[in-house]
């Protein structure tokens, strides 16, 4: 379906508002350090150009690819070399290498200040004074901090952001109305960003076969009544959408996502009985709703898989004729029967089945060789079941903060070379699995927990790739996507690690501790805990608990003192000395 002008085609399909929003997101994700005003100027220039192409598709430059147009525009930024260093070298390349170069320079951990939320009245005034600028600023600030955020979904977040201000700035108690909504958007946004980052990592590091396998498993769980051919069609379309978004082709991605939503709503009868309420909604909400839709009910009386995948004499013939289709059908059949399994477990089972067929179909008696293949599945199923059970019991016993601390200790002992801020961020997020998943009914715990852990561990992998410090992390991150979590779970205390020298400065605290929020206090204490473990990796739980209890007592005492700073100066060295003695 070729068009004389790609930019005109996308402008007409998406409409001006979405076009401008997506171009702003694209530019902000590529040039993460540029000021807002610079991006707005670039977007306005691109939009005016797009309008000339809509008026006359054969006008000059209208036939150029979007990568060429956008890349040329980015390369006009005057301060490119000073701000981005070697990223400026991308501009010497031709497409498609130039776009690949920009993609490689996306920074998952940009050195940007944390977003500070102004007073509610200040925000409401800014919203009323210039709503358009206010919303563009939101897109810009989120996109530059999350360079792989799923762009069409970010437009949905912006629409909710706008709705929250429109409603709450009229309310009697603006803050009571607005702040919970903003907190919810922030938390959902972070989760959405992390989930999308895993999809992009899957596509970029492991290829579209890995992503398609993930999608077959997930969509088969969601749509167990759909035929395999229907699931395959959805998987193909979804893979195209995410490949485009992960590749920076945000206009094509948003357009194709809208087409996919349209197709799903036109074909509900052959997909799922749960789509109805999504399909009545406007586009952005509809696409979001379809992505989050609950699993349909499993058809009754599904037969055992043994007949087709073990007992049949044609297993090797069917496998040899079309390996990926046969494995895809296996995965579909397994997944539609098991919404209680994590997607990662289902992929491990498919991988084990594939390995057995590769071995057995070359054997003298293939049938005899693969006859007991499903016995190999039992330990694969029971390992995450036991892990979820044990960790949920620990979470219920300790509560979230102490559960996070247990994970901090566990992961610092496994990979002590990883930077302290990364260990704190990742372990805190790993610890959130408890509140998120352990309260769920048993049938939903494993898919919630293990697939969430995959998302969090991907964050560790992405940060570690930027600054690699641990061979063990590199190995777990790169060897197998589906075995990342079991790989990290299996890591033990790193015996080769040379303990970090004690640095009193790391354990020196001041009166500013007292004015921190509860979350910030926790992060400070957890940072100290990681440093303690790096200093004494063989410290026992009891020793560490003792030191942390003393730390909490010392901070509480000084924060109650009249002269807080004097208290910290006097009690701090005592705490450090006592801690060293306790860990000696």
């Amino acid at each position: 379906d070729t068009h004389k002008s790609e930019v005109a085609h996308r402008f007409k399909d998406l409409g001006e508002e979405h076009f401008k929003g997506l171009v702003l997101v694209a530019f902000s994700q590529y040039l993460q350090q540029c000021p807002f005003e610079e991006h707005v100027k670039l977007v306005n220039e691109v939009t005016e150009f797009a309008k000339t192409c809509v008026a006359d598709e054969s006008a000059e430059n209208c036939d150029k690819s979007l990568h060429t147009l956008f890349g040329d525009k980015l390369c006009t930024v005057a301060t490119l070399r000073e701000t981005y260093g070697e990223m400026a070298d991308c501009c010497a390349k031709q497409e498609p290498e130039r776009n690949e170069c920009f993609l490689q320079h996306k920074d998952d951990n940009p050195n940007l200040p944390p977003l500070v939320r102004p007073e509610v009245d200040v925000m409401c005034t800014a919203f009323h004074d210039n709503e358009a600028t206010f919303l563009k600023k939101y897109l810009y600030e989120v996109a530059r901090r999350h360079p792989y955020f799923y762009a069409p979904e970010l437009l949905f977040f912006a629409a909710r952001y706008k709705a929250a201000f429109a409603e709450c700035c009229q309310a009697a108690d603006k803050a009571a109305c607005l702040l919970p909504k903003l907190d919810e958007l922030r938390d959902e946004g972070k989760a959405s960003s992390a989930k999308q980052r895993l999809k992009c990592a899957s596509l970029q590091k492991f290829g579209d076969r890995a992503f398609k396998a993930w999608a077959v498993a997930r969509l088969s769980q969601k749509f167990p009544k759909a035929e395999f051919a229907e699931v395959s069609k959805l998987v193909t379309d979804l893979t195209k959408v995410h490949t485009e978004c992960c590749h920076g082709d945000l206009l094509e991605c948003a357009d194709d996502r809208a087409d996919l939503a349209k197709y799903m709503c036109e074909n509900q009868d052959s997909i799922s009985s749960k789509l109805k309420e999504c399909c009545d909604k406007p586009l952005l909400e509809k696409s979001h709703c379809l992505a989050e839709v609950e699993n349909d009910e499993m058809p009754a009386d599904l037969p055992s898989l043994a007949a087709d995948y073990v007992e049949s004499k044609d297993v090797c013939k069917n496998y040899a004729e079309a390996k990926d289709v046969f494995l895809g059908m296996f995965l579909y059949e397994y997944a539609r029967r098991h919404p209680d399994y994590s997607v990662m477990l289902l992929l491990r089972l498919a991988k084990a089945y594939e390995a057995t067929l590769e071995k057995c179909c070359a054997a003298a008696d293939p049938h005899e060789c693969y006859a007991k293949v499903f016995d190999e599945f039992q330990p694969l199923v029971e390992e995450p079941q036991n892990l979820v059970k044990q960790n949920c019991e620990l979470f219920e016993q300790l509560g979230e903060y102490k559960f996070q601390n247990a994970l901090l200790v566990r992961y610092t002992k496994k990979v002590p070379q990883v930077s302290t801020p990364t260990l704190v961020e990742v372990s805190r997020n790993l610890g959130k699995v408890g509140a998120k998943c352990c309260k769920l009914p048993e049938a939903k715990r494993m898919p919630c927990a293990e697939d969430y852990l995959s998302v969090v561990l991907n964050r560790l992998c992405v940060l570690h790739e930027k600054t690699p410090v641990s061979e063990k992390v590199t190995k777990c991150c790169t060897e197998s996507l589906v075995n990342r979590r079991p790989c990290f779970s299996a890591l033990e205390l790193d015996e080769a690690y040379v303990p970090k020298a004690f640095n009193a400065e790391t354990f020196t605290f001041h009166a500013d501790m007292c004015t921190l929020s509860e979350k910030e206090k926790q992060v400070k204490k957890q940072t100290a805990l990681v440093e303690l473990v790096k200093h004494k990796p063989k410290a026992t739980k009891e020793q560490l608990k003792g030191v942390m209890d003393n730390f909490a007592a010392f901070v509480e005492k000084c924060c109650k003192a009249d002269d807080k700073e004097a208290c910290f100066a006097e009690e701090g060295p005592k705490f450090v000395a006592a801690s060293q003695a306790a860990l000696a």
Epitope: N295, L302, L305, D340, F377, Q378, A443
Partner: nanobody
Framework: EVQLVESGGGLVQPGGSLRLSCAAS????????LAWYRQAPGKQRDLVAR???????YYADSVKGRFTISRDNSKNTLYLQMNSLRAEDTAVYYC??????????WGQGTLVTVSS
């Protein structure tokens, strides 16, 4: 294979309650759907309630609002809580397990008699 053993049947007055249990053993890791069926004297075996691996439940119209099916995977046990029992609920109740890798399994049945 999966083995199933029912318990909890007995004689109960109309309006009373009973709780049936079904203990599964063997290849329980492979179970996806569990169900209760019943067979009244001289009748065919009918589905009473079903619970899938995802936790979704289905009830026959005749027991909706009175019976509750549940499963405890950690104990490998299926339950059927039966309230407001009626004479027409008298039957042998069978536990059924649908497996992903093995043939379906049936228990030997437990008799429930509702009579005054």
């Amino acid at each position: 294979e999966v083995q199933l053993v029912e318990s909890g049947g007995g004689l109960v007055q109309p309006g009373g309650s009973l709780r049936l249990s079904c203990a599964a053993s063997g290849s329980t890791w492979s179970i996806n759907t569990l169900a209760w069926y019943r067979q009244a004297p001289g009748k065919q075996r009918d589905l009473v309630a079903r619970i899938s691996s995802g936790g979704s439940t289905y009830y026959a119209d005749s027991v909706k609002g009175r019976f509750t099916i549940s499963r405890d995977n950690s104990k490998n046990t299926l339950y059927l809580q039966m309230n407001s029992l009626r004479a027409e609920d008298t039957a042998v109740y069978y536990c059924y397990a649908q497996s992903t890798w093995y043939p379906p399994s049936w228990g030997q049945g437990t008799l429930v008699t509702v009579s005054s």
